[in-house]
């Protein structure tokens, strides 16, 4: 049924979905502070730009009877249930936002005529890519992926002379959200990823994993994982692990890496991780991302989300045009605003953009150290350290195929 | 470079007003929630008022409610604080300071040089 | 509201010694700050979430704590850090102040 919107004649309302299923499990309330805050840091600049307008956030929770898992297995219904909720009311905002997983994102996208623009904190599948109106402030697996081809493809550096095309991949079924769809675009035939690589296998079972690390007869040198070092720790303690094997853990919202006092364990020797750069503030300021590191990414999404669309609403009512058109709709994308951190940039189809890191264990002060950083936005790699003190040989990292390269 | 800088202390009679102004350059001050803290001569930080950054939270401390009056202009980037009925207690230094209100980042980051209030008949 | 006790109310310390102060809070609070001010300067942010250093402290400082208890440490005293401490919460309305903690260099 058609749902008017609440969003003209300067009161303007945000409908955010409070799903008792998400990508990450954080307290409602939490959500519901970093919403407000965002609302806040709203008005005050629209204040500053002279525009005396309302906005304001309804909270739609489900009953949580019914869709009870916790995690995202049950939050396609749960979704739609709620989208249901919103069109009894006869009452939905200017804009979305919510949900985070992506069966959910996906099965609302498909079954309601979008009008409006849903941000989400999530939604990682490839499922939910090149959505219209649907902008995603979390790394989505495309990045990552373009990131893997990229990497894989690089020899031109003084630490990595060969083109890899080879990978295993574990993906054991039991991975948060975030990991789960990143693996799964990794897994799938028709990705990019796939495309690109003359040779994928997926290792389902720990002893798969823990066989690879000494098996003279592997195929590929290279383990993409994902998780963060104890999920490693777990599944591999303190094996030996062949001398040119190299393992990928992708562990983009953790920031743990880059604290001061952070020593790397032992097992991460011959492993390189894949995380977010740091948000800086414009400022500078050493407070700019002094959100607690575990509630950092996912509450802080939410958050910009809010701001996201003040800033979107704010340019809208400065050029005089209005909110309920597809034109706003569809703007939510290939642009840059100013997010609670700093700068916040949305490709062409609106998806955030970041700096991926990868990090390996200096040898000499088993520190964290950066190798290189790469720019999702333009898709290019720039090497960080150019004489890595690495556990391979000469400090390079190994041909992907085993008899090859430094061994 | 971020600077806060207040103005608009002085000597008062006891049961007089006053009204500080603390103005802001450097960051995007529409962004921040602001404080006032004073700190008696030789006493310790006493926390005043907060006004979040659209203006729709305001809250003060026991001790000036009823007779201060936190506000702020987003356009002027200025925070205000209207002081009434002023009592000796209120002889203080005070200091506007910025923060942000969430989570872990409610922390005073910058803080202005201050401005002196007397209060004495 | 929720007090905050520091102690000592002041501390006498030898360079190079260990300096050691609290903060106990009459109510659990998630996280602690702490501030350094220097006579006539307008206090400046030390320690954010507990532990983390504000930009330019020097690296001989540390925070810890948790719930009711929280702390400040100089592994080795220098003239420099001869100030008055204060820890600060804002984990429920109002924010609050400790009395302050005043280290003197002996």
């Known amino acids: 049924s058609q749902v008017s919107q609440n969003c003209h004649n300067g009161s303007y309302e945000i409908s955010v979905l409070m799903m008792g299923n998400s990508a990450f499990a954080e307290p409602l309330k939490n959500l519901e502070d970093a919403v407000n805050e965002g609302l806040e840091i709203v008005r005050g600049r629209l204040q500053n730009a002279g525009l005396n307008v309302t906005v304001n956030a309804t909270f739609m929770y489900s009953d949580g009877l019914i869709h009870n898992s916790g995690d995202c297995r049950s939050s396609t219904c749960e979704g739609l249930d709620l989208l249901r909720k919103i069109s009894n009311a006869q009452r939905m905002g200017c804009v979305l936002i919510g949900p985070s997983c992506t069966y959910s994102t996906f099965q609302m996208y498909l079954d309601t005529e979008l009008s409006y623009p849903m941000i989400s904190a999530g939604s990682f599948g490839l499922s939910c890519d090149y959505k219209e109106t649907l902008t995603r402030l979390m790394s989505p697996a495309r990045k990552l992926m373009y990131f893997l081809v990229n990497f894989w493809k690089t020899n031109d550096l003084p630490f990595k002379t060969y083109s890899w095309s080879t990978s295993y991949v574990y993906k054991n079924g039991t991975e948060t959200e975030d990991c789960f769809w990143y693996l799964n675009a990794l897994e799938a035939s028709v990705s990019y990823f796939s495309h690109e690589l003359g040779f994928k296998v997926v290792l389902r079972q720990d002893k798969e994993f823990q066989d690879i690390l000494m098996d003279h007869n592997r195929k590929s040198n290279v383990i993409i994982m994902c998780g963060g070092p104890e999920f490693l720790y777990k599944l591999k303690g303190d094996r030996a692990v062949a001398e040119d094997i190299v393992i990928i853990l992708v562990d983009l919202f953790n920031d743990q890496y880059f604290e001061d006092n952070v020593t790397a364990p032992d097992y991460m020797k011959n492993v390189l991780v894949l995380t977010l750069s740091p948000g800086n503030s414009l400022l500078n300021s050493s407070f700019s991302r002094n959100l607690s590191p575990t509630k950092r990414d996912f509450a802080l999404a939410y958050l910009n989300g809010i701001l996201l669309f003040g800033h979107m609403l704010k340019i809208f009512l400065e050029n005089g045009e209005n909110i309920t058109t597809p034109k706003f709709a569809h703007a939510f994308r290939n642009l840059t605003f100013e997010g609670y951190d700093g700068p916040v940039t949305l490709d062409d189809w609106g998806d955030v953009d970041s700096t991926m890191v990868l990090l390996y264990t200096s040898v000499d002060t088993k520190k964290y150290k950066v190798l290189l950083t790469y720019d999702t936005h333009v898709n290019k790699t720039y090497p960080v350290d150019m004489s890595p003190t690495f556990t391979w040989k000469n400090s390079k990292l190994p041909n992907d195929i085993t008899g090859r390269g430094p061994q | 470079e971020v600077q806060l800088v207040e103005s608009g202390g002085g000597l008062v009679k006891p049961g007089g007003s006053l009204k500080l102004s603390c103005a802001a350059s450097?960051?995007?001050?529409?962004?921040?929630?602001m404080h006032w803290v004073r700190q008696a001569p030789e006493k310790g930080l006493e926390w005043v008022a907060h006004?979040?950054?659209?203006?729709?939270?305001?809250y003060y401390a026991d001790t000036v409610k009823g007779r201060f009056t936190i506000s702020r202009d987003n356009v002027k980037n200025t925070l205000f604080l209207q002081m009434t009925s002023l009592r000796s207690e209120d002889t203080a230094m005070y200091y506007c300071?910025?923060?942000?209100?969430?989570?872990?980042?409610?922390?005073?980051?910058?803080w202005g040089q201050g401005t002196p209030l007397t209060v004495s008949s | 509201q929720i007090v905050l006790t520091q102690s000592p109310a002041l501390m006498s310390v030898s360079p190079g010694e260990k300096v050691t102060m609290t903060c106990s809070a009459s109510?659990?609070?998630?996280?602690m700050y702490w501030y350094q001010q220097k006579p006539r300067s307008s206090p400046k942010p030390w320690i954010y979430?507990?532990?983390n250093l504000a930009s330019g402290v020097p690296a001989r400082f540390s925070g810890s704590g948790s719930g009711t208890s929280y702390s400040l440490t100089i592994s080795s005293m220098e003239a420099e850090d001869a100030a008055t401490y204060y820890c600060?919460?804002?984990?429920?309305?109002?924010?609050?102040f400790g009395s302050g903690t005043k280290l003197e260099i002996k």
């Open positions: 300071a910025r923060s942000r209100n969430y989570y872990g980042s409610r922390v005073f980051d910058y």
């Open positions: 109510s659990s609070v998630n996280y």
């Open positions: 006004i979040s950054s659209g203006s729709s939270t305001i």
């Open positions: 450097g960051f995007a001050f529409s962004d921040y929630g």
């Open positions: 600060q919460q804002w984990n429920s309305n109002p924010p609050t």
């Open positions: 979430l507990t532990s």
